[in-house]
């Protein structure tokens, strides 16, 4: 009785269960009652990452430097090449097909998380007591200067974009 379903890592063809090709290999010829499935390794620039019956291997991804991409991990016969972005850039999508410059945090905002090759800068508003007066992809919000520790007094209050201005204490007259 010919099978209607096959075991894991097998496929049904012409009422027969044939072994799938292992990752890194493509199908050349289906099995017969007498012969095992014929598989061939993918060439150097190709890969297949699953047990398969593909007759063609997939081309490795090309990390195009014109799009700001560079190789993070070279592909093998079983894995695709992983691209990342050059310094100062990050991927526009999970598949990392192109790159854009990291965004800078505007004055009044500081860097919560520095950008990587795959994620953009994360900014946060400077809370009370902190400020940022620059547009930067690296700078965190800085604390206002503590006038008291310098034996000074606050002459001008700080904001989320400016530091406090300290000045000397007024001397009491005798």
């Amino acid at each position: 009785e010919p099978p209607t379903a096959c075991r894991e890592k097998q496929y049904l063809i012409n009422s027969q269960c044939c072994s799938l090709c292992q990752p890194g290999q493509k199908l050349v010829s289906d099995c017969t009652e007498f012969t095992e499935t014929e598989c061939l390794p993918c060439s150097e620039s190709e890969f297949l990452d699953t047990w398969n019956r593909e007759t063609r291997c997939h081309q490795h991804k090309y990390c195009d430097p014109n799009l700001g991409l560079q190789v993070q991990q070279k592909g093998t016969s079983e894995t695709d090449t992983i691209c990342t972005c050059e310094e100062g850039l990050h991927c526009t999508s999970e598949s990392c097909e192109s790159c854009v410059p990291h965004r800078s945090c505007l004055p009044g905002f500081g860097v919560k998380q520095i950008a990587t090759g795959v994620s953009d800068t994360i900014c946060e508003p400077c809370p009370v007591g902190f400020f940022s007066n620059v547009s930067s992809a690296f700078e965190k919000c800085r604390p206002w200067t503590s006038c008291e520790t310098k034996d000074l007094v606050v002459q001008q209050a700080g904001t989320n974009k400016t530091d406090v201005v300290c000045g000397p204490q007024d001397r009491q007259r005798a």
Epitope: N14, S29, D30, C31, T32, E33, F34, T35, E36, E38
Partner: antibody, heavy 117, light 109 residues
Framework: QVQLVESGGGVVQPGRSLRLSCAAS????????MHWVRQAPGKGLEWVAV????????YYADSVKGRFTISRDNSKNTLYLQMNSLRAEDTAVYYC??????????WGQGTMVTVSS | EIVLTQSPGTLSLSPGERATLSCRAS???????LAWYQQKPGQAPRLLIY???SRATGIPDRFSGSGSGTDFTLTISRLEPEDFAVYYC??????????FGGGTKVEIK
Amino acid sequence: QVQLVESGGGVVQPGRSLRLSCAASGFTFSSYGMHWVRQAPGKGLEWVAVISYEGSNKYYADSVKGRFTISRDNSKNTLYLQMNSLRAEDTAVYYCARDTSRGHDIWGQGTMVTVSS
Amino acid sequence: EIVLTQSPGTLSLSPGERATLSCRASQSVSSSYLAWYQQKPGQAPRLLIYGASSRATGIPDRFSGSGSGTDFTLTISRLEPEDFAVYYCQQYADYPPFTFGGGTKVEIK
């Protein structure tokens, strides 16, 4: 390169025996089924026998059933055809050929068997 | 047993002409398992076409196969001097036996 080379042919008297060999090289012999096909002088191709890659499945043409035995030794990359009770009509060139789902893709050069008194 | 009948027995043509060879089966054959072979004098057969219409590795594109069910055709679009030979069809769908047709000889006119 992928190659099949037959040997063991010759002239033999009717009723006698002969063993043909087919030496394989250039491919994983133990993964392929193998066939014997023959061709009488001036005639067409006639399929004789097949054996599966591990030797468990064997089929024969009615004309040789009970007289011929196909076997293989995967450790020696060699296919055999034991021919007993030979008849004049067994006179032919005997070819071994590799089995695939695409047909017989590799053939040997053949070995001549002549059954004559 | 599936009987394959090839016609014509002999085809006399000149180089450059088109050759059409027929193979008829006594019952329906899965086209996945119909092959054509070429054999020259003193040589072993060579696989030309498998699965009724797919060319084997290294076979020039002047050779083509077609057909389904019980009627199959091998066409050589423009005969080259090296194409004059005997051609056999074979079915390997229904076995035993694996059957060959009687052959068609393509000879120079």
